[in-house]
């Protein structure tokens, strides 16, 4: 089929970066500036993506590939190919419809994006809380109370960075 197609269709000889120009007797013309064709044999070139506003250019549009955008500082990409930019929050916060809000007690977020997640429940694994959780950090689980033999020194957790959170037991 491919052989037949190439014999009948002169456009199949046009490489990526060009289009088959019907106005010029089906010769291969380079894609004009701000357009591209990522595959051969195309009859038109696609318009390049413009990285404007909150988007910034990561890679320019070439004749064979679309521009790639990411987000300006203070924002991060969402969706395939960075189709949206979402506002960053601070660690210990999550983005809501009303903006960045602190994580509720018992939850944390150690990134500038995403939602607050519950602290680990150490007791589910038969362990105890070694370091208390904060808005920014999960609790650190330690050995179970039974593992601490009599006379063994227990670890005193450091002062929490924010509020003295505890893992719900």
């Amino acid at each position: 089929f491919e052989r037949t197609r190439s014999l009948q269709d002169p456009c199949s000889n046009c490489p990526a970066g060009t289009f088959c120009d019907n106005n010029r007797n089906q010769i291969c013309s380079p894609c004009p500036p701000n357009s591209f064709s990522s595959a051969g044999g195309q009859r038109t070139c696609d318009i390049c993506r413009q990285c404007k506003g909150v988007f910034r250019t990561r890679k320019e549009c070439s004749s064979t590939s679309n521009a790639e955008c990411d987000c300006t500082p203070g924002f991060h990409c969402l969706g395939a190919g960075c189709s949206m930019c979402e506002q960053d929050c601070k660690q210990g916060q999550e983005l809501t419809k009303k903006g960045c809000k602190d994580c509720c007690f018992g939850t944390f977020n150690d990134q500038k994006r995403g939602i607050c997640r519950p602290w680990t429940n150490c007791s589910l694994d038969g362990k105890s809380v070694l370091v208390n959780g904060t808005k920014e950090r999960d609790v650190v689980c330690g050995p179970s109370p039974a593992d601490l033999s009599p006379g063994a020194s227990s670890v005193t957790p450091p002062a929490p960075a924010r509020e003295p959170g505890h893992s719900p037991q």
Epitope: G17, C31, N34, S62
Partner: antibody
Framework: EVQLVESGGGLVQPGGSLRLSCAAS????????MIWVRQAPGKGLQYIGF???????YYTNSAKGRFTISRDNSKNTLYLQMNSLRAEDTAVYYC????????????WGQGTLVTVSS | DVVMTQSPSSVSASVGDRVTITCQAS??????LAWYQQKPGKAPKLLIY???TLASGVPSRFSGSGSGTDFTLTISSLQPEDFATYYC??????????????FGGGTKVEIK
């Protein structure tokens, strides 16, 4: 008037460092690909790299590691920091503005000569 | 790297002649090729980009064609101010986000 003016060239010893400047007027450099190209005496053109409108820098393989491109948007000035200079870095250094959202040098400065010699 | 082979390295021509310079890429670069003119002691001047797009202010006697690996710069009727050195330049984005900007070796157009 839209123009680019390079400065900072001169004589430097092998192993030394130099920072070239490129002052732009008539347009805003942060909205364009800004490029450095060099040309050794009697030789052809050699691309160094660019900084794009998204603040990303790209370098050709020969420039990676020793050369750093940056800009100061408040001064509308482009820079090329060159370290560990060698005799073969002797060249006229041109800054340029990309054409049409690309990294093809469209508008060029007059160039500044860097001589690396002991 | 993408290697650009430009030919001829020099050409002698007269005013009014049609001059053709070719550039061959070591791998397909689509249409990501530009042509520059440089006169002694001066900065280069962009003539054509995207293989065939004439840069602003460039006379229409200059034209570019080609795609993939083979490209041509044509000066339809050589003028006295056209005696200079001409360079092609390819842009190629590698899969590893390395970008290759490679110039050809240059073609000197001299007076016959």
């Amino acid at each position: 008037e839209v123009q680019l003016v390079e400065s900072g060239g001169g004589l430097v010893q092998p192993g030394g460092s130099l920072r070239l400047s490129c002052a732009a007027s008539g347009f805003t450099i942060s909205s364009h690909h800004m490029i450095w190209v060099r040309q050794a005496p009697g030789k052809g053109l050699q691309y160094i790299g660019f900084i794009n409108d998204g603040d990303y820098t790209y370098y050709t393989n020969s420039a990676k590691g020793r050369f750093t491109i940056s800009r100061d948007n408040s001064k509308n000035t482009l820079y090329l920091q060159m370290n560990s200079l060698r005799a073969e870095d002797t060249a006229v250094y041109y800054c340029a503005r990309g054409v049409d959202g690309t990294s093809y040098p469209g508008l060029w400065g007059q160039g500044t000569l860097v001589t690396v010699s002991s | 790297d993408v290697v650009m082979t430009q030919s001829p390295s020099s050409v002698s021509a007269s005013v009014g002649d049609r001059v053709t310079i070719t550039c061959q890429a070591s791998q397909s670069i689509g249409a990501d090729l530009a042509w520059y003119q440089q006169k002694p002691g001066k900065a280069p001047k962009l003539l054509i980009y995207r293989a065939s797009t004439l840069a602003s202010g460039v006379p229409s006697r200059f034209s570019g064609s080609g795609s993939g690996t083979d490209f041509t710069l044509t000066i339809s009727s050589l003028q006295p101010e056209d005696f200079a050195t001409y360079y092609c330049q390819a842009i190629y984005y590698g899969t590893d986000d390395v970008i290759y900007h490679t110039f050809g070796g240059g073609t000197k157009v001299e007076i016959k």
